[in-house]
């Protein structure tokens, strides 16, 4: 059956032979209506990439550099299955390219000029492409030929396989630049030995190299890693201090109509029948015909790449930056230490307009990028299409898991001038009901619920976390009869109460009328029994404070809070009647952009923050007529975090634990991708 056939692309006679064997053996173990293999032979991996894009083949396994080529237009391929190494219990699908130095040296990443460098080999990922790609814009001009620029940047190097005649400085630490193990400083162990012997000041290797060469922790403690933010960390902290995370070997397919489920079904069956130590007659991860045919011999199996993970996310910002710099050879005109405009990520149409207005008023210091959901915005910040946005704590958690860092906190209670340096305790997540109802925390089952959005703190993580510990399952749509929780599955009962309009029904952005704090409260006013919001929501939308038609006549006393002990209290008493304390919303950014974002925002709030009194004829950063566009409208200032500069420290142990528990019920494709 053609639609059940996976056309595998082979790049040599030997690969084609193995592919035919793969095809025949799979036929013998799979049912006739299951997936099948067909083989397509091409001259090179690049030809395979083009063939898949043109729908002449379906899959091929590629190294990281070729995954980059596959992702570029017009190919637009995406990773669908990853080879893993190590054990099934602790599968490794990535390695980390690191810069190792001796602990007793005193320079940082931005002080490598004039040092001596040790590389695994010319053109190799961890030893050359990544470090030189990331240093590219610091190299002296002209940057072509590249070897000459590198030779003039470092005071001496060992770059195995380089041309020692044309570029003698690249072979200064290993005469001849031998391209095999006859050169004692060749490859990973060799580059590390070059550092260890004192020949070089820095070695560009894999994170595992240090562990493979130094079994003793005391010996490893004599070395450190250079981080991109110009700090150092211990060699154990490679996940937080590396030049790039590099995928090892990956199966790619078309982004649209790519048969990824079929490819996974095929490879999953293949690893069951012909994986490591499974079969004598055919082995997926070895071959009598040659090394690394179709798949790496060192692979132990396959893992499905989460569907939300596109090639940009899979390869990572640092890796793509390095490879793009090397391939395109372009550098920004401004010096790299100068802050370029900050690209703010705006959610859908309304936020984009406010962001545009901010951009004009900032004289272009702020630029705007849009996405339809918060998760899409986070992904854009991760891959460099945007730089920053302000997030509810639930999304600060997801952003943190995706490698972003909190930069500034929204403060709601501290008056100026102390605001900028004050760390607030947070706000209260509350459950609001109509005073006329007889609801309590203990009889919510079967009622109609209103939520700010799935994944947000007050509207979801806190109430659903508490509910989960009571009902011990994730079927929240069965607990409530119906509700509006923007971001839920469209056919879920938790979208039934949403107002839309139609194509935007239940979307987690301002196009859905019941989205956010004000939207969830409106949902309660018009249709629901309980709304999960922040403690300020009722006062901010009653007594004529919200002029919209649905809100202008509402009275605060017509609403009450549900307390966890089964009682109810006035909305004026949130301190004594709340579900939990929630961390304030915070601005997040990539680590490399955090300082720029902080500096610019502190400057912007001095001009457009809460000191502006007349928002009807001036731009106000923290004002959008109860719509909470870009920032919460009740923000007094953006405050420095001081030492709360990681998502764990910012959110606090208790909240992180609560959200981690709720991950069993996670509907976040981005979180799944970021924890792959």
């Amino acid at each position: 059956v053609p639609e059940k056939s996976v056309r595998w692309c082979a790049v040599s006679e030997h690969e084609a032979t193995k592919c035919q064997s793969f095809r025949d053996h799979m036929k013998s173990v799979l049912p006739s209506n299951g997936p099948s293999v067909a083989c397509v032979k091409k001259a090179s991996h690049l030809d395979c990439i083009r063939a898949i894009a043109a729908n002449e083949a379906d899959a091929v396994t590629l190294d990281a550099g070729l995954v980059y080529d596959a992702y570029l237009a017009p190919n637009n391929l995406k990773p669908v299955v990853a080879e893993f190494y190590g054990s099934k219990e602790d599968p490794q699908t990535f390695y980390y390219a690191v810069a190792v130095v001796k602990k007793d040296s005193d320079f940082q990443m931005n002080q490598l000029r004039g040092r001596k460098s040790c590389h695994t080999g010319l053109g190799r990922s961890a030893g050359w492409n990544i470090p030189i790609g990331l240093l590219y814009c610091d190299l002296p001009e002209p940057r072509k030929p590249l070897e000459k620029a590198v030779a003039n940047f470092f005071s001496g190097s060992c770059v195995p396989c380089a041309d020692g005649t044309d570029f003698p400085q690249l072979c200064q630490l290993c005469p001849g630049c031998g391209c095999s193990t006859l050169n004692q400083y060749f490859s990973y162990s060799g580059a590390f030995k070059c550092l260890k012997d004192g020949a070089g000041d820095v070695a560009f290797v894999k994170h595992s190299t240090i562990f493979e060469n130094l079994a003793n922790k005391a010996d490893r403690d004599q070395y450190e890693l250079l981080c991109l933010d110009n700090t150092r960390k211990s060699v154990d902290e490679y996940k937080d201090c590396h030049l790039a995370r590099v995928p090892s070997h990956t199966v790619v397919a078309r982004s649209v109509g790519g048969k990824e489920d079929l490819i996974w079904e095929l490879l999953n069956q293949a690893q069951e029948h012909f994986g490591k130590d499974k079969s004598k007659e055919f082995q997926l991860f070895s071959s009598p015909h040659g090394k690394d045919l179709l798949f790496k011999d060192s692979a132990h199996g396959f893992l499905k790449v989460p569907p939300r993970m596109d090639a940009k996310m899979y390869l990572g910002y640092e890796y793509i930056t390095a490879i793009r710099n090397l391939r395109e050879g372009t550098c920004p005109e401004a010096p790299t230490d100068e802050c370029k405009p900050v690209k703010w990520c705006a959610l859908s149409h309304h936020e984009r307009l406010k962001c545009d207005e901010w951009s004009v008023n900032s004289a272009g210091k702020i630029e705007c990028e849009s996405a339809e959901t918060t998760e899409d915005c986070i992904a854009k910040i991760m891959n460099g299409e945007a730089d920053a946005m302000s997030l509810d704590g639930g999304f600060v958690y997801i952003a943190g898991m995706c490698g972003l860092v909190p930069v500034l906190a929204e403060n709601y209670n501290t008056p100026n001038p102390n605001c900028e340096n004050t760390a607030e305790e947070g706000y209260f997540a509350v459950a609001v009901v109509k005073s006329s109802s007889d609801l309590t925390w203990d009889n919510l089952k079967g009622k109609k619920s209103c939520h700010t959005a799935v994944g947000r703190t007050a509207g979801w993580n806190i109430p659903m976390g508490l509910l989960y510990s009571k009902i011990n399952h994730c079927r929240f749509d069965e607990f409530f009869s119906e509700g509006c929780a923007p971001g839920s599955e469209k056919n879920s009962s938790l979208c039934k109460l949403c107002m839309g309009p139609s194509p935007n029904l239940c979307e987690p952005n301002n196009k859905e009328g019941y989205y956010g704090y004000t939207g969830a409260f409106r949902c309660l006013v018009e249709k629901g029994d309980v709304a999960f919001v922040k403690h300020q929501t009722v006062p901010q939308n009653t007594g004529g404070k919200n002029p919209d038609a649905w809100a202008k006549n509402l009275k605060e006393e017509d609403y009450e809070l549900l307390c966890l002990d089964g009682s109810r209290k006035s909305v004026q008493e949130p301190a004594n009647c709340h579900l939990a304390r929630a961390p304030n919303h915070a601005v997040v950014a990539r680590k490399d952009k955090a300082d720029c974002v902080q500096t610019l925002l502190l400057d912007q709030q001095r001009m457009f923050g809460s000191s502006v009194t007349d928002c009807s004829s001036n731009f106000c950063l923290f004002e959008s007529k109860t719509k909470d566009l870009l920032f919460r409208d009740d923000t007094v200032c953006l405050a420095k975090l001081h030492d709360r500069n990681t998502y764990e420290k910012y959110l606090g142990e208790e909240y992180v634990k609560a959200v981690t528990n709720l991950r069993k019920c996670s509907t976040s494709p981005l979180l799944e991708a970021c924890t792959f």
């Epitope: 309304h350 307009l353 545009d356 207005e357 004009v360 008023n361 731009f619 959008s624 719509k627 566009l629």
Partner: nanobody, 117 residues
């Protein structure tokens, strides 16, 4: 609420110039930032240029150096001088005052600009 009327569009050859005007009436005391947007068929509406009451301006990268935004506060009018026009500048051009546009969708009729030989 502010009413906005755009004018000045038309058909022009590549390399040519046009000057768009946008006249505001209604609660004009509330106008701070004004901007020109454009929307080409099948594309999202995008910011072309903006200007604050005090004259701070910003431009989309694709029009920098070719387009100039200005305003006459006495006449409550904002202008967009478009030089060195290119076929990719073809779109309906709208002006907005921002005072209400990001709460409700208040957009004028726009003015069509077509750049073609």
């Amino acid at each position: 609420q502010v009413q906005l009327v755009e004018s000045g569009g038309g058909l022009v050859q590549p390399g040519g110039s046009l000057r768009l005007s946008c006249a505001a009436s209604g609660s004009i005391f509330s106008i701070n930032t004004m901007a020109w947007y454009r929307q080409a068929p099948g594309k999202q509406r995008e910011l072309v240029a903006g200007i604050t009451r005090s004259g701070t301006t910003t431009y989309a990268g694709s029009v920098k150096g070719r387009f100039t935004i200005s305003r006459d506060n006495a006449k409550n009018t904002v202008y967009l001088q478009m030089n060195s026009l290119k076929p990719e500048d073809t779109a309906v051009y709208y002006c907005t005052d921002y005072s209400s546009s990001y709460y409700q969708d208040y957009w004028g009729q726009g003015t069509q600009v077509t750049v073609s030989s």
